[in-house]
């Protein structure tokens, strides 16, 4: 009788579809992820199964708590789609599909500087390029550890460019750039490039 009741409940909204989610939706190859399959009904003993496309990855029983499936994303096909099934006795419902976005991390960018020196000013052009990593890549330029540009998004493998004009300074300035894509908490920085102070013939980046 209980199985019949459960099945009848499923035909109403008393037993809705489970929800499949992960805290990390954007991942890089080799990353470990946890997938959570949960259900609104906290009183039933539910069997959760996880699938990717048409392969079965695992089964767990749960009551009140989400089932946690731990996976390692090592191949492109492991991005998904995933779905989970919640089953009570002979009745089951499926979640919506869930897919990860696999992103290659950015490599350390290279910063190039070009300077046009006038009597009073320096016209500085900064170029920053990360040769590896999934696009788009956001570049930010820094002077003495302070951001001097907005994030510049590049959807192609071309350097980001930022121009600035400075009064001929009396002290050294250090420039670097940051490259970041959709991978959360993963940014890389170029080696710093130091611009010497003015005085004498000390402008190694200047166009004469």
């Amino acid at each position: 009788r209980k199985a019949v009741l459960d099945c009848e409940a499923m035909k109403t909204n008393e037993f809705p579809s489970p929800c499949l989610d992960s805290k990390t939706k954007v991942v890089m190859k080799g990353q470990n992820v946890s997938m959570f399959c949960s259900h609104k009904n906290k009183s039933l003993q539910i069997t959760y199964s996880l699938f990717r496309r048409k392969t079965h990855l695992g089964t767990q029983d749960g009551k009140g708590e989400p089932a946690i499936f731990n996976l390692s994303i090592t191949e492109a096909h492991e991005s998904g789609p995933y779905k989970c099934k919640a089953q009570v006795t002979s009745c089951s419902k499926y979640s919506r599909d869930f897919s990860f976005t696999i992103v290659d991390p950015v490599t350390s960018p290279v910063l190039n500087i070009m300077v046009i020196q006038t009597e009073t000013d320096r016209h500085i052009t900064l170029h920053c390029l990360s040769v590896n990593g999934s696009l788009p890549i956001n570049y930010t330029f820094f002077e003495n550890h302070v951001a001097i540009s907005p994030a510049i998004s590049k959807y192609d493998r071309e350097p980001a460019e930022f121009n600035l004009t400075k009064k001929n300074p009396g002290e050294e300035e250090e420039y670097r750039c940051e490259a970041k894509n959709r991978l959360p908490n993963y940014a890389t920085y170029s080696h710093p490039v130091t611009m010497p102070s003015t005085g004498g013939d000390s402008c190694p980046f200047c166009l004469k």
Epitope: S49, F51, R52, K54, T55, H56, L57, H77
Partner: antibody, heavy 119, light 111 residues
Amino acid sequence: EVQLVESGGGLVQPGGSLRLSCAASGFSLTIYTITWVRQAPGKCLEWIGTINSYGNTYYSTWAKGRFTISRDNSKNTVYLQMNSLRAEDTAVYYCARGYVDSDWYLNIWGQGTLVTVSS
Amino acid sequence: IQMTQSPSSLSARVGDRVTITCQSSESVYDNNYLSWYQQKPGKAPKLLIYDASRLASGVPSRFSGSGSGTQFTLTISSLQPEDFATYYCLGGYDSSGWYAAFGCGTKVTVL
């Protein structure tokens, strides 16, 4: 070249045991699923069981308990251990590879190995 | 789980349109976890159709598949001499564990 080669078949007495091997080349068992299928002389194809890329195993109702599938990743080989063999287990045994993430779309097959259970 | 294939055998001529059906006692996983195979005597089966209707690599376009849930069809639009063989369907299920089942085959012979 992607291929599967079965071995280990032969004549065995009723009640005996046999271990079949399925050697994979050209691909890794850590990515693909391997399924064992058998065919008695003049009869239908019959699903025995499957081992997926994660090492999870699945069996048909009749095979559970008597047949065991395992794998050795270092040898890139899958095994079918068959115990308590009966005359009705006489068949050609095939191993087959599924598509990535599709256990039972069997696109690569071995040549088969004949198992005869007779006294 | 029962996978019933019909007819069990049929005779046809070259150029004929041939239809084979597979009826499952319950729905396959995702409503389309079904594949079709061709087998010739003494040979291993060959994958023809997957996802119920998608043509496997290298399979001639005269083969097609259709259906969903519990009822599936394999059609050969114009039978060729090399098509005389036995055809099997294979369904994947998740109702009582992760499970597969073959139909018992349809033998296509020359009329």
